[in-house]
Amino acid sequence: SERCDDWGLDTMRQIQVFEDEPARIKCPLFEHFLKFNYSTAHSAGLTLIWYWTRQDRDLEEPINFRLPENRISKEKDVLWFRPTLLNDTGNYTCMLRNTTYCSKVAFPLEVVQKDSCFNSPMKLPVHKLYIEYGIQRITCPNVDGYFPSSVKPTITWYMGCYKIQNFNNVIPEGMNLSFLIALISNNGNYTCVVTYPENGRTFHLTRTLTVKVVGSDISRGLNDIFEAQKIEWHEHHHHHH
């Protein structure tokens, strides 16, 4: 086959998704590597092709888009799993080509399992809140594009294993979790579970993030000074012994 610009394995995008949940994965070519978007490419007669290499295998194979209930499908530059299975783990490649042009990139996809308390090998984003600062909100992340705005999902928030439902200082408000006043005791992992219907089926999206309650800007500024002084003292001490 003709030469193809191969961007290799994009390990910057370590995509992790939960087993038995929908996942939508955009082809990284248009996000990070090419200077044009999918619409432009499509209008210019370029075709986007997907294939994958299973975990612990070397053989590249086409993705089966003829599974029951369209479990895996492609829509524009997005690869959809409705839902994922554990053995979907592998390296996925999207290739953009026509007779005169070819560009491709691969990325790893890991399907991970979670327990009933949402513990998993998933790397968690950290959200900082300032202590006793007044109202602060966190938003259930990465759920855009899974359902149209006409669909009203139900959202349940958990701290660790426990559903948040009392009117304490942390209050679920749909896609937002509002901290009326952030306290050190609010440190921990927070999970939103978004449940929505699609074609007679019910899907769940689970998103967990770590909340870290930190000092205010003022106390943080003082902390930075103290830390700098500590480092300075440590280096001075070290050089004289």
């Epitope: 349940t156 009117f167 200082n169 209050i171």
Partner: antibody, heavy 118, light 112 residues
Framework: QVQLVQSGAEVKKPGASVKVSCKAS????????MHWVRQAPGQGLEWMGI????????SYAQKFQGRVTMTRDTSTSTVYMELSSLRSEDTAVYYC???????????WGQGTLVTVSS | QSVLTQPPSVSAAPGQKVTISCSGS????????VSWYQQLPGTAPKLLIY???KRPSGIPDRFSGSKSGTSATLGITGLQTEDEADYYC????????????FGGGTKLTVLG
């Protein structure tokens, strides 16, 4: 469309209790909180409390603590507000209102007039 | 006696601009979001502004909200006769217990 339909007007004697109902439709009942707000004749709005229809948890204004009880029936998408030991100053229009805590109260019932008179 | 202080009344002619103030403290307005409601005579209140300055769908952009420190302001431009109503500000306070608080209300009269 979202609708909150409240029960009809009530006349009660001092010392009695009143139970006002509020039937919700047009949205997922358990996805929003329900507030109760009252308005005495010619006066402003006064918040009484809030209920989470999902789990049934409540938070009441200090002023009404011990006298008010908010409950819900998820099978009929209805919330209830019961106020006991009524006195003449409890004469007011009582509103149920859907909303969150930090982003406003977006839909209101039509109001229920409760008159307390001997 | 309301925790949030509003002027009892304001008035202006049609087409004019009017502002309604709402004064609180650091334990309510200062650290939290403010909502505004319009109550036409004989009807239930209606949400005009939430999160200090956001309008629900269907609310015209003649209505605006702002917040500075421990005070909030509702602005109405291009006054219309149907704007004659009572206006309430609202926020909350949390000191171990949640408490939603309303201002005492402001009666807006559209002159003429």
């Amino acid at each position: 469309q979202v609708q909150l339909v409240q029960s009809g007007a009530e006349v009660k004697k001092p010392g009695a209790s009143v139970k006002v109902s509020c039937k919700a439709s047009g949205y997922t009942f358990t996805s929003y909180y329900m507030h109760w707000v009252r308005q005495a004749p010619g006066q402003g709005l006064e918040w009484m409390g809030i209920i989470n229809p999902s789990g049934g948890s409540t938070s009441y204004a200090q002023k009404f603590q011990g006298r008010v009880t908010m409950t819900r029936d998820t099978s009929t998408s209805t919330v209830y507000m019961e106020l006991s030991s009524l006195r003449s100053e409890d004469t007011a229009v009582y509103y149920c209102a859907r909303g969150f805590v930090t982003s406003g109260i977006d839909y209101w019932g039509q109001g229920t007039l409760v008159t307390v008179s001997s | 006696q309301s925790v949030l202080t509003q002027p009892p009344s304001v008035s202006a002619a049609p087409g004019q601009k009017v502002t309604i103030s709402c004064s609180g403290s650091s334990s309510n307005i200062g650290n939290n979001y403010v909502s505004w409601y319009q109550q036409l005579p004989g009807t239930a209140p209606k949400l005009l502004i939430y999160d200090n300055n956001k309008r629900p769908s269907g609310i015209p952009d003649r209505f605006s909200g702002s917040k500075s420190g421990t005070s909030a302001t509702l602005g109405i431009t291009g006054l219309q006769t149907e704007d004659e109503a009572d206006y309430y500000c609202q926020t909350w306070t949390y000191t171990g217990r949640l408490w939603i608080v309303f201002g005492g209300g402001t009666k807006l009269t559209v002159l003429g």
